[in-house]
């Protein structure tokens, strides 16, 4: 029951996280005009990964896409790539995890296969979350660097009579959405990996020897679950028994439909 709950919760958390990563990637407010010195501005600038926007205080908003590909900063391209990789991995992870959910029965899919898929989706969610966090962090670092550079320019370029106000940019809402979403996806992935460890023992936590129906060959299994991950084909259609010696863990285990040849 706890395994099902952990897996289900991991799936839901990852789903929310990936939705957040998609939202952050699409948002226009990755960087917003710094209003520290001028809280009320007649023209407000903000930028996303795909376009930059200007909102005038009268209500008019105009956005322009970055129609060039080669002319964009390499860092921006890298952030785009990281976010897209995160979304793609997350989407595939979601697809895999749907089939891996313990509460969903698909044909005669074995628990070992479900455990395998749960681990795979968990790893995908972890990488997806890391990609999003990395992408957002790279962009944030770029903003911090540019912020202090423009601040330095502001105070060195005041010699003339005519003032040219340089626009400084600070963290936009999309960065916080991205960080939170990446974190949630990461947490969801970890939960899926934990659930996978709970799924696998159902088939492989019987200890001692492996007994074939023919009764001619006997293979001794010394380590039980700790010696074998349960993802190999050696567990398929085999009766695993313990000769009467049960561990505390095994008291709760019941035969699955593949335990008998």
């Amino acid at each position: 029951m706890a395994v099902t709950a952990c897996q289900g919760l991991g799936f839901v958390v990852s789903l929310i996280g990936i939705a957040g990563i998609i939202a952050a990637t699409c948002m226009d407010q990755w960087s917003t005009q710094d209003l520290y010195n001028n809280p009320v501005t007649a023209v407000f600038n903000y930028q996303g990964l795909w376009r930059s926007c200007v909102r005038e205080s009268s209500g008019f908003t105009e956005c322009r896409g970055y129609f060039t590909l080669l002319g964009l900063p390499a860092m921006l391209q890298a952030v785009r790539a990281l976010m897209i990789v995160g979304i793609v991995l997350g989407a595939i992870g979601l697809l895999v995890s749907i089939f891996a959910l313990k509460c969903i029965r698909i044909g005669s899919m074995e628990d070992s296969a479900k455990a395998n898929m749960t681990l795979t989706s968990g790893i995908m969610f972890i990488v997806s979350g890391l990609c999003a966090i990395a992408g957002v962090s790279v962009f944030a670092n770029m903003l911090v660097t540019n912020f202090w550079m423009s601040t330095a320019n502001m105070y060195t370029g005041m010699g003339g009579m005519v003032q040219t106000v340089q626009t400084r940019y600070t963290f936009g809402a999309a960065l916080f959405v991205g960080w939170v979403a990446g974190g949630l996806t990461l947490i969801g992935g970890v939960m899926m990996c934990i659930a996978c460890r709970g799924l696998a023992p159902e088939e492989t936590n019987y200890k001692a020897v492996s007994y074939h129906a023919s009764g001619h060959s006997v293979a001794y299994k010394p380590g039980g679950f700790k010696a074998s991950t349960g993802f190999g084909s050696n567990t398929k259609n085999k009766k695993i028994y313990d000769g009467g010696a049960r561990t505390e863990d095994e008291v709760q285990s019941y035969p699955s439909k593949h335990d008998y040849v």
Epitope: V40, N45, S57, R64
Partner: antibody
Framework: QVQLQESGPGLVKPSETLSLTCTVS?????????WNWIRQPPGKGLEWMGY???????NYNPSLKSRITISRDTSKNQFSLKLSSVTAADTAVYYC???????????WGQGTLVTVSS | DIVMTQSPDSLAVSLGERATINCKSS????????????LTWYQQKPGQPPKLLIY???TRESGVPDRFSGSGSGTDFTLTISSLQAEDVAVYYC?????????FGQGTKVEIK
């Protein structure tokens, strides 16, 4: 096309409060515009006084900030100007105007002359 | 506040001739976000409210004759009437639309010589 019409008393006594209303037709006051008050003393230039925007936020000229209030009544499709403690220097033609793209005043009322005199 | 200074204060031009009005701002009106200059030009005829001619320094408002054109960037701007007509006699104002409070130039009176 949006049309604007100012209304209010043409004569106000010094130290009293000047109150004007602008009625909007051909458009909603809740639409994505800013609704401004601009004044022009006789024979002089234009002075922007302040606005109330589509979301109800106001912004005033600092030179008038302590005396000015702009509000709106969405049910009547009107917005209003209140200017307290008036003096003879506040005698002017008062215009209401709509600003949008480029923060430019695209529609104007005909203007109403307000004289401050005892 | 941004101070807008127009020159000349008045201008007499023959019909069909070119009229040029200058406007200088005390700060740059160029917005780096969209590379647009937030300067607007208005025409005001006697007894009438001002009429929008040009916004973003060079974009003509719909319905405005193409003899009116705006140019300039940063702090220096120009309104040009390529061929002055009798109906162009008016006072012309430039406006800072970039920074609060929005401010106007003192106006330039255009007359026929």
């Amino acid at each position: 096309q949006v049309q604007l019409q100012e209304s209010g008393p043409g004569l106000v006594k010094p130290s009293e409060t000047l109150s004007l209303t602008c009625t909007v037709s051909g458009g909603s006051i809740s639409s994505n515009y800013a609704w401004n008050w601009i004044r022009q003393p006789p024979g002089k230039g234009l002075e922007w006084m302040g606005y109330i925007n589509y979301s109800g936020n106001t912004n005033y000229n600092p030179s008038l900030k302590s005396r000015i209030t702009i509000s709106r009544d969405t049910s009547k499709n009107q917005f209003s100007l209140k200017l307290s403690s008036v003096t003879a220097a506040d005698t002017a033609v008062y215009y209401c105007a709509t600003s949008y793209y480029g923060n430019s005043f695209i529609y104007w009322g005909q203007g109403t002359l307000v004289t401050v005199s005892s | 506040d941004i101070v807008m200074t127009q020159s000349p204060d008045s201008l007499a031009v023959s019909l069909g001739e070119r009229a040029t009005i200058n406007c200088k701002s005390s700060q740059s009106l160029l917005n780096s976000g969209n590379q647009k200059n937030y300067l607007t030009w208005y025409q005001q005829k006697p007894g009438q409210p001002p009429k929008l001619l040009i916004y973003w320094a060079s974009t003509r408002e719909s319905g405005v004759p193409d003899r009116f054109s705006g140019s300039g960037s940063g702090t220096d701007f120009t309104l040009t009437i390529s061929s002055l007509q009798a109906e162009d006699v008016a006072v012309y104002y430039c406006q800072n639309a970039y920074s609060f409070p929005w401010t106007f130039g003192q106006g330039t009176k255009v007359e026929i010589k």
